[in-house]
C-alpha cells in the first residue's frame, strides 16, 4: 500500500524528521510548513492549524525558507564609493559593491563594508598588477627603455619609440622625443609620440616585472635624484 | 640615416683587423649606441659589443668578446671594431648597428635595452690560411 | 649564460596561411625581446620589440605576444614577401645577463 501523504501540521513519526521547506515546532510538537522567501511566520502553528505567513514589509527581507517571526532590516543605503548591484526587496538584501577606481578594503558577508580608491602610480612608475574588486594596485619603477608619463591606476611602463633621429633621450617618465625625421615606429592617428602596441592586450594585462639587476645607465644628460620608495600618488 | 661598414678582408689566422662603421644622416654623439653583431657563413646572429658615442663612450660586450675585440669611437661619424688573434671561426659577415639611449634615474648598475633599429650591409671577414 | 631557444627551425606556409614562431629564454627577461626578419644578402630587420611593438612600415600582420620566458611571432595572412630568416633577440643587457639571438626560424612561402 502507497504511503499516506501527511498534511501539515503533522507529527511525525518517532526517530524520523520533518520533510523539506518544514520545521519541527516544540511548542506544537508538530511537523509545520515553513514560509517562502520574502515572508516570516505571522502566526506559528499549532496541533491544529498550520504556520500563518505574511509578506515582508518594506526594506525587510527573507531570502530562505523560514519561520523568523519577523524580516530581516535590508542594510543602509550605499555610500557616494559605492554601487548598488542588488536592490532591496522581499527577499534580498542590498548588495552595495566598489565604484569603478575603488577596491573593497574591508569585505562583508556579501558586498563590502569599506571602500577605498585604487592607489594611481606617479610617472616613472607603471602598474605591476592590477587592482581587483578585493586588492589594491601595485606600482613598480619603470625598467630601463620604458617610462610612463600619466598618474594612473591602469597605465603600464610603455617602451620608448624608436626614433630616426632622437632630440630628447627617453626617461622613466618620459617617452623618447623625436626630431621633425618621422620615428620607426608606427604612430597612433592625432597621437604624437606614443607607442602602439600591435596585440590587442589592453593596459590592463600582465606588465613587465622590473629587471632583477636594478637597472641603469648614464646617458647624456645629468642624473637625476632618485625617485621615492614608493610610486604612488594619493587620490 | 644609414650605417656602412668597411675594412673587411682575408686574413691568416692571428692577425689583426680593424672594422670601420660610418653613419650618415645622423651623429653617432646623440643618443644613440653603436653596436656591432656578426653572422657566420649559413649561420644565425651573434652579438659583439656596443659603445655609446658620447664624451665618455661607454662601452659593453659579450663575455666571449671581451679581450679580443675592441670598440672605439673615432670621429662623430665612425665608429671602429678592433680585432685580435683571429682565428677561422670569426669567419663572419660583420654588421654595425645602432641602438637607441634612454635615460634613467635613481637606479644603480648597467642595463641596457638593446633593440638594433638601423643596420649596415655587412662586411665579410674571411679568415683562412 | 642567457639562452633563446627559437622553435621551430624551419616552417612552409602557404600564402594567406598563418605561421607561428616560438622563442623560449632560459630565464625571465621581462618582455625585453625583439624579432628581425632577414632576407638573404640583407641586413636584419626590426620587426617588433619590447615583446609586442610594432616598428612602422612593418605590416599589421604580423603580432608579437608573449611574456617571462615564452614569446611568440605571428604571421597571419603570410604573403610570398614574408619569405624569410626570423630571428628573436633578449634586447635585455645587464651586468649578469646578456643580449642574445635565437637560433633563427626560416619561413617558406608556397
Known amino acids: 500500500l502507497p504511503a499516506q501523504v501527511a498534511f501539515t501540521p503533522y507529527a511525525p513519526e518517532p526517530g524520523s524528521t520533518c520533510r523539506l521547506r518544514e520545521y519541527y515546532d516544540q511548542t506544537a510538537q508538530m511537523c509545520c510548513s515553513k514560509c517562502s522567501p520574502g515572508q516570516h511566520a505571522k502566526v506559528f502553528c499549532t496541533k491544529t492549524s498550520d504556520t500563518v505567513c505574511d509578506s515582508c514589509e518594506d526594506s525587510t527581507y527573507t531570502q530562505l525558507w523560514n519561520w523568523v517571526p519577523e524580516c530581516l532590516s535590508c542594510g543602509s543605503r550605499c555610500s557616494s564609493d559605492q554601487v548598488e548591484t542588488q536592490a532591496c526587496t522581499r527577499e534580498q538584501n542590498r548588495i552595495c559593491t566598489c565604484r569603478p577606481g575603488w577596491y573593497c578594503a574591508l569585505s562583508k558577508q556579501e558586498g563590502c563594508r569599506l571602500c577605498a580608491p585604487l592607489r594611481k602610480c606617479r610617472p616613472g612608475f607603471g602598474v605591476a598588477r592590477p587592482g581587483t574588486e578585493t586588492s589594491d594596485v601595485v606600482c613598480k619603477p619603470c625598467a630601463p627603455g620604458t617610462f610612463s608619463n600619466t598618474t594612473s591606476s591602469t597605465d603600464i611602463c610603455r617602451p620608448h619609440q624608436i626614433c630616426n633621429v632622437v632630440a630628447i633621450p627617453g626617461n622613466a617618465s618620459m617617452d623618447a622625443v623625436c626630431t621633425s625625421t618621422s620615428p620607426t615606429r608606427s604612430m597612433a592617428p592625432g597621437a604624437v609620440h606614443l607607442p602602439q602596441p600591435v596585440s590587442t592586450r589592453s593596459q590592463h594585462t600582465q606588465p613587465t616585472p622590473e629587471p632583477s639587476t636594478a637597472p641603469s645607465t648614464s646617458f647624456l644628460l645629468p642624473m637625476g635624484p632618485s625617485p621615492p620608495a614608493e610610486g604612488s600618488t594619493g587620490d | 640615416q644609414s650605417l656602412e661598414e668597411s675594412g673587411g678582408d682575408l686574413v691568416v689566422p692571428g692577425t689583426s683587423l680593424t672594422l670601420t662603421c660610418t653613419a650618415s644622416?645622423?651623429?653617432?654623439?646623440?643618443?644613440?649606441?653603436m653596436c656591432w653583431v656578426r653572422q657566420a657563413p649559413g649561420k644565425g646572429l651573434e652579438w659583439i659589443a656596443c659603445?655609446?658615442?658620447?664624451?665618455?663612450?661607454?662601452t659593453y660586450y659579450a663575455s666571449w668578446a671581451k679581450g679580443r675585440f675592441t670598440v672605439s669611437r673615432t670621429s662623430s661619424t665612425t665608429a671602429t671594431l678592433q680585432m685580435t688573434s683571429l682565428t677561422a671561426a670569426d669567419t663572419a659577415t660583420y654588421f654595425c648597428?645602432?641602438?637607441?639611449?634612454?635615460?634613467?634615474?635613481?637606479?644603480?648598475?648597467?642595463?641596457?635595452?638593446?633593440?638594433?633599429?638601423?643596420w649596415g650591409p655587412g662586411t665579410l671577414v674571411t679568415v683562412s690560411s | 649564460a642567457l639562452v633563446m631557444t627559437q622553435t621551430p627551425a624551419s616552417v612552409s606556409a602557404a600564402v594567406g596561411g598563418t605561421v607561428t614562431i616560438n622563442c623560449q629564454a632560459s630565464?625571465?627577461?621581462?618582455?625585453?625581446l625583439a624579432w628581425y626578419q632577414q632576407k638573404p644578402g640583407q641586413p636584419p630587420k626590426l620587426l617588433i620589440y619590447y615583446a609586442s611593438y610594432l616598428t612602422s612600415g612593418v605590416p599589421s600582420r604580423f603580432k608579437g605576444s608573449g611574456s617571462g620566458t615564452e614569446y611568440t611571432l605571428t604571421i597571419s595572412g603570410v604573403q610570398c614577401d614574408d619569405a624569410a630568416t626570423y630571428y628573436c633577440q633578449s634586447a635585455f643587457y645587464s651586468n649578469n645577463t646578456e643580449t642574445a639571438f635565437g637560433g633563427g626560424t626560416e619561413v617558406v612561402v608556397k
Open positions: 630565464e625571465d627577461i621581462d618582455s625585453y
Open positions: 648597428a645602432r641602438h637607441q639611449s634612454y635615460e634613467t634615474y635613481g637606479y644603480v648598475g648597467v642595463v641596457y635595452a638593446t633593440y638594433f633599429s638601423l
Open positions: 644622416g645622423f651623429d653617432l654623439s646623440s643618443f644613440y649606441y
Open positions: 659603445i655609446y658615442a658620447v664624451s665618455s663612450g661607454s
